[in-house]
């Protein structure tokens, strides 16, 4: 079947990094500079992505694969394939329409991105606050009086923070 298909369509023999050149009797021509084809049998090569401005090149374009970008220091990637760059804030802040703003009392952010999240409510688990929260750190929950029996664990760390969604304000 492959043999039959290649007789019918000579382009199917063109490997990645080349294209089937209709102007030259459908022979396989190498992709021109700044272009690539990642699969065989292509009739055109795709233009390489250029990492300009706030984007910087993480991986150069080759004849068989597109360039990959990341963001300049002080920014982080968003979207599939780092389609956007978003500015970082400091820990203890979140990014809003008005720029980087400190977390409100009772919330924290231990990352340079994402939103401020409420401190863990220790009392919901019958615990007490062992270490107070800050803008940058969650509270640490300690034992309730009933837990202070011999052999009981004295500190319950808060649940690991998940990657937050992003809230504009």
């Amino acid at each position: 079947f492959e043999r039959t298909r290649s007789l019918q369509d000579p382009c199917s023999n063109c490997p990645a990094g080349t294209f089937c050149d209709n102007n030259r009797n459908q022979i396989c021509s190498p992709c021109p500079p700044n272009s690539f084809s990642s699969a065989g049998g292509q009739r055109t090569c795709d233009i390489c992505r250029q990492c300009k401005g706030v984007f910087r090149t993480r991986k150069e374009c080759s004849s068989t694969s597109n360039a990959e970008c990341d963001c300049t220091p002080g920014f982080h990637c968003l979207g599939a394939g780092c389609s956007m760059c978003e500015q970082d804030c400091k820990q203890g802040q979140e990014l809003t329409k008005k720029g980087c703003k400190d977390c409100c009392f009772g919330t924290f952010n231990d990352q340079k991105r994402g939103i401020c999240r409420p401190w863990t409510n220790c009392s919901l688990d019958g615990k007490s606050v062992l270490v107070n929260g800050t803008k940058e750190r969650d509270v640490v929950c300690g034992p309730s009086p009933a837990d202070l029996s011999p052999g009981a664990s004295s500190v319950t760390p808060p649940a690991p923070a998940r990657e937050p969604g992003h809230s504009p304000q």
């Epitope: 401005g53 968003l78 389609s83 760059c85 500015q87 504009p168």
Partner: nanobody, 123 residues
Framework: EVQLVESGGGLVQPGGSLRLSCAAS????????MTWFRQAPGKGLEWVAH????????YYEDSVKGRFTVSRDNAKNSVYLQMNSLRAEDTAVYYC????????????????WGQGTTVTVSS
């Protein structure tokens, strides 16, 4: 081709004014927030201001509030930064950038960047 081209930079004395322009092409300008950033010599990029698609919302970095005004003309596919009462610390390369789809609703990411225009404030 999607493109942003800044102009209007130059040398100005402290207390002076400049108006920067950013001409957009290759995309539907009126569908995007537009943002100004700047980079002072030896420093990182700093957000300056941004403006909503229809110009109805504008926000500024604290140090430029009351001195800088961002505006846009969707008929001319352009965004502007009027800079008054300029100070030495405003010396920087100024860039305009396009807010990506969903900007301000779910993120503040930019996806297209101009080449920059240099503003020097010096006596």
């Amino acid at each position: 081709e999607v493109q942003l081209v800044e102009s209007g930079g130059g040398l100005v004395q402290p207390g002076g004014s400049l108006r920067l322009s950013c001409a957009a092409s290759g995309f539907t300008f009126s569908s995007h927030w537009m943002t100004w950033f700047r980079q002072a010599p030896g420093k990182g990029l700093e957000w300056v201001a941004h403006i909503k698609e229809d110009g109805s919302e504008k926000y500024y970095e604290d140090s430029v509030k009351g001195r800088f005004t961002v505006s846009r003309d969707n008929a001319k596919n352009s965004v502007y930064l009027q800079m008054n009462s300029l100070r030495a610390e405003d010396t920087a390369v100024y860039y305009c950038a396009r807010g990506g789809d969903g900007y301000s609703d779910s993120h503040f990411g930019v996806d297209v960047w101009g080449q920059g225009t240099t503003v020097t404030v010096s006596s």
